[in-house]
Amino acid sequence: SPSPVTPSPTLKELIEELVNITQNQASLCNGSMVWSVNLTAGMYCAALESLINVSDCSAIQRTQRMLKALCSQKPAAGQISSERSRDTKIEVIQLVKNLLTYVRGVYRHGNFRGLNDIFEAQKIEWHEHHHHHHHH
């Protein structure tokens, strides 16, 4: 028989889980390091890609499952999952805390912008930054 479809976690549930695993914790997963993730529209997929490389860490298994469900929920978000800082590694707990901040913002304010709008904004910001450095 087909396996039951697991309902996608809500942002509220993800927040609760992230709070749960970071509360009063100085470290997670024995201080394992992962690639840093830019806070973009593809955060869930990018965070998952980064955290998926952490094995033997039961503390983040539920988070990994939730991110997997949220990432597969939006194909558009999956397409930009490579939005990572390949030159920066941070501790797992820092990545999880960054994710918590981002998700709280989305939960609270709603995803006001469409993905295209966000990319447009990022392009403009990159151009302004690039242009600025050209003149200094």
Epitope: E16, G105, H109, G110, R113, E125
Partner: antibody, heavy 116, light 111 residues
Framework: ELTLQESGPGLVKPSQTLSLTCVVS?????????WDWIRQRPGRGLEWMGS?????WYNPAFQGRISITADTAKNQLSLQLSSVTTGDTAVYFC???????????WGQGTLVTVSS | QSVLTQPASVSGSLGQRVTISCSGR????????ANWYQQVPGKAPKLLVS???NRPSGVPDRFSASNSANSATLTITGLQAEDEADYYC???????????FGGGTQLTVLG
């Protein structure tokens, strides 16, 4: 009509803890909304301090010395800010945050002066 | 210094149209847009327009807001004397992990 009313001592000594209460009337303090504290220092802009909801969270700028709690039975919100300095002299507002709207209800604010 | 930049002051004559800008970045306005508040000196701020364009009942349709890329703009048409106040934009910043406000803009209505 929902109303929010802040109260607390108008004068606090440096290094002490500032304690304020926000009483909500005409509605309930529930986790359907987020209930925030925002302050405004003299001649300055608005500064978010923290939010009470299922998972209370704070502005990292205040982390370690702030506590926001709610007593849903009494329909009130509380703010505690420890180790205050003269830089904490401000008008303190409580406000309700509604998703997709913003801060739709505010208290009238209460002035707290930190001075010895 | 605020991460959301607003002009310190703007002025306009009665009946005129004025705009107040709020400049941010991708990690605040670029993602979450901005809400706008009006504050009369000595009073609490009052919500004018949300990032979704919602206006609370009681707020005249002379007040409107728009968002483009990493900035937001509040437009007031048919300026009236009672519009003289401070105006604040507000968003969420993922880098700071905090709700953020612009520094505020003082609007002066010229007689």
């Amino acid at each position: 009509e929902l109303t929010l009313q802040e109260s607390g001592p108008g004068l606090v000594k440096p290094s002490q803890t500032l304690s304020l209460t926000c009483v909500v009337s005409g509605g309930s303090v529930t986790n359907t909304y987020e209930w925030d504290w925002i302050r405004q220092r003299p001649g300055r802009g608005l500064e978010w301090m923290g939010s009470w909801t299922d998972n209370t969270w704070y502005n990292p700028a205040f982390q370690g010395r702030i506590s926001i709690t709610a007593d849903t039975a009494k329909n009130q919100l509380s703010l505690q800010l420890s180790s205050v300095t003269t830089g904490d002299t401000a008008v303190y507002f409580c406000a309700r945050w509604t998703k997709r709207w913003g801060y739709d209800y505010w208290g009238q604010g209460t002035l707290v002066t930190v001075s010895s | 210094q605020s991460v959301l930049t607003q002009p310190a002051s703007v002025s306009g004559s009665l009946g005129q149209r004025v705009t107040i800008s709020c400049s941010g970045r991708t990690n605040n306005i670029g993602y979450f847009g901005a809400n706008w508040y009006q504050q009369v000196p000595g009073k609490a701020p009052k919500l004018l327009v949300s990032s979704y364009g919602n206006r609370p009942s009681g707020v005249p349709d002379r007040f409107s807001a728009s968002n483009s890329a990493n900035s937001a703009t509040l437009t007031i048409t048919g300026l009236q004397a009672e519009d003289e106040a401070d105006y604040y934009c507000q968003s969420f910043d993922t880098t700071l992990g905090a709700v953020v406000f612009g520094g505020g803009t003082q609007l002066t209505v010229l007689g």
